[in-house]
């Protein structure tokens, strides 16, 4: 057989954040190359990352076609320089990935506070509505467009002079909170999908504080 020195891929792992989705696997190739195929449960296999020596393959373009579909990938191993060779059963060696449903499983990326504006004893904090690679009608959808009411944001805020944090939640991208006049506050936000069982929360955004150089109004 031509596959004497060929080993099957293993540890196939989906790495996905805000629908940017990469399949990773092992081992680093020695005298072999890989090709990846992806399919939905009821669809045909589509080949990607042909005869690559990488151990990752960006499958974003495929999964963003429908983020509620469940996808399966498989990684084929071929001898380097002899990609026509097959295993003893007439097939190249391959390994299947776990199933992956982007809507349920993609990690939420770190959000960014776009701006904050104080009027009297109220502060309006706006979270940037991050663009994803999911398209509809030739336009890229934002995270809010994709997740709709499944997505909320949690705001953590505290006086610059103390460590006691308060929280607020919104199912839009804006918060309106009460603050003490004359006090500076710091803010951090987190994206949350409360009804998820895995990957429910993003990491916290960078902290932004009132009275710093960036000022209260930022584009």
């Amino acid at each position: 057989s031509g596959t004497t020195n060929t080993v099957a891929a293993y540890n196939l792992t989906w790495k996905s954040t805000n629908f940017k989705t990469i399949l990773e696997w092992e081992p680093k190739p020695v005298n072999q190359v890989y090709t990846v195929q992806i399919s939905t449960k009821s669809g045909d296999w589509k080949s990607k990352c042909f005869y690559t020596t990488d151990t990752e393959c960006d499958l974003t373009d495929e999964i963003v076609k429908d983020v509620k579909q469940t996808y399966l990938a498989r990684v084929f191993s071929y001898p380097a320089g002899n990609v026509e060779s097959t295993g003893s059963a007439g097939e190249p060696l391959y390994e299947n990935s776990p199933e992956f449903t982007p809507y349920l499983e993609t990690n939420l990326g770190q959000p960014t506070i776009q701006s904050f504006e104080q009027v009297g004893t109220k502060v309006n904090v706006t979270v940037e509505d991050e663009r994803t690679l999911v398209r509809r009608n030739n336009t890229f959808l934002s995270l809010r467009d994709v997740f709709g009411k499944d997505l909320i944001y949690t705001l953590y805020y505290w006086k610059s002079s103390s460590s006691g944090k308060k929280t607020a939640k919104t199912n839009t991208n804006e918060f309106l909170i009460d603050v003490d006049k004359g006090e500076n506050y710091c803010f951090s936000v987190q994206a949350v999908i409360p009804s998820r069982t895995v990957n429910r929360k993003s990491t916290d955004s960078p902290v932004e504080c009132m009275g710093q150089e960036k000022g209260e109004f930022r584009e």
């Epitope: 509620k68 579909q69 809507y103 349920l104 009411k149 909320i152 199912n171 009804s195």
Partner: antibody, heavy 118, light 107 residues
């Protein structure tokens, strides 16, 4: 264990109002939208609207918008659906249903029969 | 609103038979389809979501497929406990709408 327990059967006269309750337990109440779906005798399912238990914000089916009000009591993990100006065609079983991630209704109450009769 | 047309409205099959129900949406709903089972006098029960994903604890004989406007629900081998009415529902665009139901009986 997730449970949605609804209030008992009601008999109402045309023109009256009815308020049905749905008490949730076994999960984070504010993390899931609660929907109301009704089913007339021998008929199919009809979505009436939903409420966000975290904010109290609601979205109604246009067909019921003028007559339905959904409210929430976070302290008792209970949502309410009030339907006013009842008519005979409102005779139905009314279900509360928890909306799962992405839209489907994963858990349903046992149903409350509302009979509208003069 | 999106209309969901389900067929047939009723069917009769023998135990062990393969049963297929179809649902057609009046416009594309991507894969935003769920299927429910309702037994007489009981609340509906979610079987399939996102067109093809089995909900927790649902037996493997139940499956769903389709995309866009045309969807299929299949019971691979009908069991006596499957006697019920089955509904499709689109959860793609509010107001969420249901098909008219398919009553499944045993011959």
């Amino acid at each position: 264990e997730v449970q949605l327990v609804q209030s008992g059967a009601e008999v109402k006269k045309p023109g009256a109002s009815v308020k049905v309750s749905c008490k949730a337990s076994g999960y984070s109440f504010t993390g899931y939208y609660m929907n109301w779906v009704r089913q007339a005798p021998g008929q199919g399912l009809e979505w009436m609207g939903e409420i966000n238990p975290s904010t109290g914000g609601s979205t109604y089916n246009q067909k019921f918008k003028a007559r339905v009000t959904m409210t929430v009591d976070q302290s008792t993990s209970t949502v309410y659906m009030e339907l006013s100006s009842l008519r005979s065609e409102d005779t139905a079983v009314y279900y509360c249903a928890r909306r799962e991630l992405g839209g489907p209704f994963g858990y349903w109450g046992q149903g409350t029969t509302v009979t509208v009769s003069s | 609103s999106i209309q969901m047309t389900q067929s047939p409205s009723s069917l009769s099959a023998s135990v062990g038979d393969r049963v297929t129900i179809t649902c057609k949406a009046s416009q594309s709903v991507s894969s935003g389809i769920a299927w429910y089972q309702q037994k007489p006098g009981k609340s509906p029960k979610l079987l399939i979501y996102f067109a093809s994903n089995r909900y927790t604890g649902v037996p493997s004989r139940f499956s769903g497929s389709g995309y866009g406007t045309d969807f299929t629900f299949t019971i691979s081998s009908l069991q006596p406990e499957d006697i019920a009415t089955y509904y499709c529902q689109q959860d793609y665009s509010s107001p969420w709408t249901f098909g008219g139901g398919t009553k499944v009986e045993i011959k």
